[in-house]
């Protein structure tokens, strides 16, 4: 799978994680930090 960094306009899209662009799927994706979930890593779970 080819990945690259998200465009600058997506800065802040992922609240607790890193935004990556999945080139083959044409999708931005939030890779969440440990303890966070959700489309934008907005939910904390214990």
């Amino acid at each position: 799978v080819s990945i690259t960094k998200c465009n600058s306009d997506m800065n802040g899209y992922c609240l607790h994680g890193q935004c990556i662009y999945l080139v083959d799927m044409s999708q931005n994706y939030c890779r969440c930090e440990v303890g966070y979930t959700g489309v934008r890593c907005e939910h904390f779970y214990l």
Partner: antibody
Framework: QDQLVQSGAEVKKPGASVKVSCKAS????????IQWVRQAPGQGLEWMGR????????KYREKFEGRVTITADTSTNTAYMELSSLRSEDTAVYYC?????????WGQGTLVTVSS | DIQMTQSPSSLSASVGDRVTITCKAS??????IAWYQQKPGQAPRLLIQ???TLQPGVPSRFSGSGSGTDYTFTISSLQPEDIATYYC????????FGGGTKVEIK
């Protein structure tokens, strides 16, 4: 399926304000950004600004700063664009556009006519 | 704001011709460019995103290329149904559309 349904056509007098709504269904606007783009008759496409409904953060094109306000109501899954101090040059079709995980998905457009 | 200079503003070509449109950005946009087709009275239709990724259902005669500040959109063999106005859009930093290219049949 995913939809962005915009409010109906408006006719306004110069100096007035207009507020266009954009109701999302099939997805949560908190997962997206909502952009606003306009197109005057016979003219090109012009980006106006956008909102991050989750953070309630906005970005506007410089030429619209102070005249446009983009808001979002996450309880009704609806975004709004209000443009004030209308002039004849603001006559255009206004589009809301979803961006975020996937690339742009457009509403059907709202015609705003400014005429005395 | 990033400026997008699109050329030509209009062109006339014959059916079967190869048509090329260019967009030049005022700074590096890291391949974050999309191309739209718009027919009169219709909303814009997304053809290509991320420089060269064709949208599902878009004919393979449409293609895109480029990097840095210089990008190209090509119709390899112009068809009558391709008569429309085409716009580039940079979405690396905020958003800026090119001025559009009106494509007509000669």
């Amino acid at each position: 399926q995913d939809q962005l349904v915009q409010s109906g056509a408006e006719v306004k007098k110069p100096g007035a304000s207009v507020k266009v709504s954009c109701k999302a269904s099939g997805f949560n606007i908190k997962d997206t950004y909502i952009q606003w783009v306009r197109q005057a008759p016979g003219q090109g496409l012009e980006w106006m600004g956008r909102i991050d409904p989750l953070r309630r953060q906005t970005k506007y094109r410089e030429k619209f700063e102070g005249r446009v306000t983009i808001t979002a109501d996450t309880s009704t899954n609806t975004a709004y664009m209000e443009l004030s101090s209308l002039r004849s040059e603001d006559t255009a079709v206004y589009y809301c556009v979803r961006s975020g995980r996937e690339f742009d998905f457009w509403g059907q457009g709202t015609l705003v006519t400014v005429s005395s | 704001d990033i400026q997008m200079t699109q050329s030509p503003s209009s062109l006339s070509a014959s059916v079967g011709d190869r048509v090329t449109i260019t967009c030049k950005a005022s700074q590096d946009i890291h391949k974050y460019i999309a191309w739209y087709q718009q027919k009169p009275g219709q909303a814009p239709r997304l053809l290509i995103q991320y420089t060269s990724t064709l949208q599902p259902g878009v004919p393979s005669r449409f293609s895109g290329s480029g990097s840095g500040t210089d990008y190209t959109f090509t119709i390899s063999s112009l068809q009558p149904e391709d008569i429309a106005t085409y716009y580039c859009l940079q979405y690396d930093n905020r958003r800026t559309f090119g001025g559009g290219t009106k494509v007509e049949i000669k």
